[in-house]
């Protein structure tokens, strides 16, 4: 048993890192591998993370962390029973995959304009929670070519447009995602997404 | 081992106050993040409070927002929970309980609040 | 506040029956959610983390699925030791909210 992708995680900067690496060969990981995590600094522990079956040969382990700080750093070591499959090292810090944005609302009852708003995914005490910006997907349900991202790169989770520059009579859907520049973090998941019907006034033309 | 002992529970008056205790031992204290759990006779868990280890940020459930207070001493390896102006819904075993996400609870300390 | 509902509240079932306990968020927590079982005058422990990853020590027949609004505990087949309440927990965002407990009692 060899492992063919050494494992790559990504943190969320809060509660969850996320390990996931390739087997050579089809493997039940929950019964045949563990995934031992230990913080370093004198007198920590390790901590067990049976890992899950993410197609044939892939494995995903959640590691359960307490509340990251910059200088968090983790040994880790893959074991198949009594053998080292891999050891390596991790830092929530520098593999961050921020937590999806959440509560995505349109609110079409302000006049000509559509307002949508969400919430930021972090409490305000951490550090990401002042640091997240984040693009808007709006795409129509009826045309596959009418899909476009605002990208919102102001602290405030809420981004405002005209009604018209969507078609009016029509579904459109919209759904969030965030990144962190200060930590160079991948994208977020996007949030679910949320539908609305586009409809407005024309304005009265004068001849 | 790890362990958590909470004590400073027991009667007291509506509307009076009481200071519980939880001290630490096994593992470094300063380290982890704390909450308190509490159980109403009978009933389910409820999560009443959190504290930081990065930030020392905390937080409440709105049940008891503004009358309890968490703390820690992390040179005591203590955490407290600070209960003013108490009701008798407050009435609870109260836990202790570490982080991530309740890996390791205490006993529990009986608080009665009655007349 | 994010709601965790519970169901059912509670369940009569015999050693070596399929148990399914469903918790459903008030809104999208994607995978924050934890199972703890709770037996009589003892202290919660946990299950299962992160919707579905079983805790360490803990054994293979209990396992959680589900992400965003919907989730299940599942004991493969009940033992003797297993009858006791069950709670789901959100740490997606504070207040964290437990669901209200699933008491699994002897047919």
């Known amino acids: 048993m060899k492992v063919l992708q050494e494992p790559t995680c990504v943190s969320d900067y809060m509660s969850i890192s996320t390990c996931e690496w390739k087997m050579n060969g089809p493997t039940n990981c929950s019964t045949e591998l563990r995934l031992l995590y230990q913080l370093v600094f004198l007198l920590s522990e390790a901590h067990t993370c049976i890992p899950e079956n993410n197609g044939g040969a892939g494995c995903v382990c959640h590691l359960l962390m307490d509340d990251v700080v910059s200088a968090d750093n983790y040994t880790l070591d893959l074991w198949a029973g009594q053998q080292l499959l891999w050891k390596g090292s991790f830092k929530p810090s520098e593999h961050v995959k921020p937590r999806a944005p959440g509560n995505l609302t349109v609110h079409t009852n302000v006049s000509d304009t559509l307002l949508l708003t969400w919430s930021n995914p972090y409490p305000p005490d951490n550090y990401l929670y002042n640091h997240l910006t984040y693009a808007v997907n709006i795409w129509s349900e009826n045309d596959p070519a009418d899909f476009r991202i605002y990208n919102v790169t102001y602290l405030e989770p809420s981004l405002r447009i005209a009604a018209r520059t969507l078609k009016s009579g029509i579904s459109y859907r919209a759904r969030v995602r965030a990144w962190a520049q200060c930590y160079n973090t991948t994208w977020s998941e996007w949030s679910p997404s949320t539908k609305w019907h586009n409809s407005y006034r024309e304005p009265f033309e004068q001849h | 081992q790890v362990q958590l002992v909470e004590s400073g529970g027991g009667l007291v008056q509506p509307g009076g106050s009481l200071r519980l205790s939880c001290v630490a031992s096994g593992f470094t204290f300063s380290h982890s993040s704390m909450n308190w759990v509490r159980q109403a006779p009978g009933k389910g868990l409820e999560w009443v409070s959190y504290i930081s280890r990065a930030t020392g940020a905390v937080y409440y459930a709105d049940s008891v927002k503004g009358r309890f207070t968490i703390s820690r001493d992390n040179a005591k390896n203590s955490l407290y929970l600070q209960m003013n102006s108490l009701r008798d819904e407050d009435t609870a075993v109260y836990y202790c309980a570490r982080e991530p996400v309740f890996d390791y609870w205490g006993q529990g300390t009986l608080v009665t609040v009655s007349s | 506040d994010i709601q965790m509902t519970q169901s059912p509240s509670a369940m009569s079932a015999s050693v070596g029956d399929r148990v399914t306990i469903t918790c459903r968020a008030s809104?999208?927590?994607?995978?924050?959610l934890a199972w703890f079982q709770q037996k009589p005058g003892k202290v919660p422990t946990r299950l299962i983390y992160?919707?579905?990853s079983l805790q360490s020590g803990v054994p293979s027949r209990f396992s959680g699925s589900g992400s965003g609004t919907e989730f299940t505990l599942t004991i493969s087949s009940l033992q003797p030791e297993d009858f006791a309440t069950y709670y789901c927990l959100q740490w997606s965002s504070y207040p964290r909210t437990f669901g209200q407990g699933t008491k699994v009692e002897i047919k």
């Open positions: 809104q999208d927590i994607s995978n924050y």
């Open positions: 992160a919707a579905s």
